[in-house]
């Protein structure tokens, strides 16, 4: 996360950080006790690594009572994502059991109206991806509150150039972000998830390159029907 | 398949005014910016402006700022051009397109015939 | 204005031939963001403009790929390997990085 700032302790019991041999690669959302939503490229970086989840966390590095790493059942990347473009970048990752819920660990309700979200609303984008340029990665969970920005804006030639199809949805960019190590990650509008960070290799920080985001009611029915 | 549909040819008196329309199908109006070029005969093109179709915003090459007035329909999808103190030097084909990927779809072009 | 200068004004091809179009602007066209739009557009007679190249170098989907741009800060450069019947037009050069966004004058592609 760029231009943001540390994010409460725990005050986001719903996100996950999806490790490969105990390292962060992105973020995640619990959206059901064994489910966690994530970006579907992220599984490319995995390569033949051990995929686990870290729930309850708000450091990655210190001992904390409500954290715990849960190995994955099964990965399920959308079925038309593909490694070249950025479309239907989701991913769900089934634990190997049920969640131990509580205060610091708790699915998020996830949008199913397929609605834009009015442009210019203030949305919660948290996760542990780089904080500068330089690549630094934080310890502990970060977060930035984004406008959304409209998506004829986002298509513009300067901005994405006609890649943001109605399944995706754009946030501003200027200085403050989502970056590398935050795909997967959640967008929150209002208390409910609208969007999955998407894991291309955007320049981070620059207001003509707005972040990209999954726009989860665009796939309310599959999802359904892979938590079914 | 994405179109864009412009109103037919005018031949308007000068000192009239002049709107004409540009009708989006086959994608989502909202999604993207339109654009409006004019192009004289035998000449090259010139940007006129551009229109966010979702907040009506505008932005004008200067040159057609007192000249040019872009607006939308959002309901039909529809984006309008007018043109006013039409002198002989307005006579153009005048052409839409949409933004994104670049200046990729472009409507067949409206001839405005400015004459006595 | 950032004023885009394209030589020759005509150009006489034998089809099968190869063509080269120059294009230069009065400034850098790299855009605050980094890249460069620097496109190149073809009219054919009585039809309105095609896109064949974005971002100085990239094909619009299904342009053949006998058609290349290149070129860098203020010059540019399309290239056609093996011209075609299909070829003939006018092909234009335009930037998108500065506003207003503005065309080349143009440059007539035509049979020997």
């Known amino acids: 996360i760029l231009g943001g700032r540390e994010a409460e302790a725990h005050a986001r019991p719903y996100m996950a950080s999806v490790q490969v041999n105990g390292e962060h690669l992105c973020g995640g959302v619990l959206v059901a006790e064994q489910w966690v939503l994530s970006a579907a490229h992220c599984l490319e970086d995995a390569a033949d690594g051990k995929v686990q989840v870290l729930l309850g966390a708000h450091s990655l590095s210190q001992p904390e009572p409500s954290k715990r790493l849960y190995d994955v059942l099964r990965a399920v990347p959308h079925p038309d994502s593909r490694p070249d473009t950025i479309d239907h970048d989701l991913l769900l990752l089934q634990l190997s059991e049920k969640a131990t819920l509580g205060p610091a660990v708790r699915p998020l309700p996830w949008q199913r109206v397929d609605r834009d979200v009015e442009p210019g609303t203030l949305c919660d984008v948290a996760g542990w991806g780089i904080v500068s340029h330089a690549g630094r990665r934080p310890d502990r969970l970060q977060h930035v509150l984004l406008p959304v920005l409209d998506r004829a804006t986002c298509n513009r030639r300067t901005h994405h150039d006609g890649a943001i199809t109605q399944r995706m949805m754009c946030a501003e960019s200027n200085r403050r972000d989502s970056c590398k190590g935050d795909s997967g990650g959640p967008l929150v509008c209002g208390g409910v998830l609208e969007g999955v960070v998407t894991s291309g290799s955007r320049v981070c920080g620059n207001r003509k390159k707005p972040g990209i985001y999954t726009r989860v009611a665009s796939y309310a029915a599959w999802i359904d029907s892979v938590l079914a | 398949e994405v179109q864009l549909q412009q109103s037919g040819p005018e031949l308007v008196k000068p000192g009239a005014s002049v709107k004409i329309s540009c009708k989006a199908s086959?994608?989502?109006?909202?999604?993207?910016?339109t654009n409006w070029m004019r192009q004289r005969h035998g000449e090259s093109l010139e940007w006129i402006g551009d229109i966010n179709p979702n907040t009506g915003d505008t932005s004008y090459n200067q040159k057609f700022r007192v000249k040019a007035t872009l607006t939308v329909d959002k309901s039909s999808g529809t984006a309008y051009m007018g043109l006013r103190s039409l002198t002989s030097e307005d006579s153009a084909v005048y052409y839409c397109?949409?933004?994104?990927?670049?200046?990729?779809?472009w409507g067949q072009g409206t001839l405005v015939t400015v004459s006595a | 204005d950032v004023l885009m200068t394209q030589t020759p004004l005509s150009l006489p091809v034998s089809l099968g031939d190869q063509a080269s179009i120059s294009c230069r602007s009065s400034q850098t066209i790299v855009h605050s963001n980094g890249d460069t739009y620097l496109e190149w557009y073809l009219q054919k007679p009585g039809q309105s403009p095609n896109l064949l190249i974005y971002k100085v170098s990239n094909r619009f989907s299904g342009v053949p790929d006998r058609f290349s741009g290149s070129g860098s800060g203020t010059d540019f450069t399309l290239k056609i390997s093996r011209v075609e019947a299909e070829d003939l037009g006018v092909y234009y050069c335009f930037q998108g990085s500065h506003v207003p966004p503005t065309f080349g004058g143009g440059t007539t592609l035509e049979i020997k």
């Open positions: 086959g994608y989502t109006f909202t999604d993207y910016y």
């Open positions: 397109t949409r933004e994104g990927p670049s200046f990729a779809y």
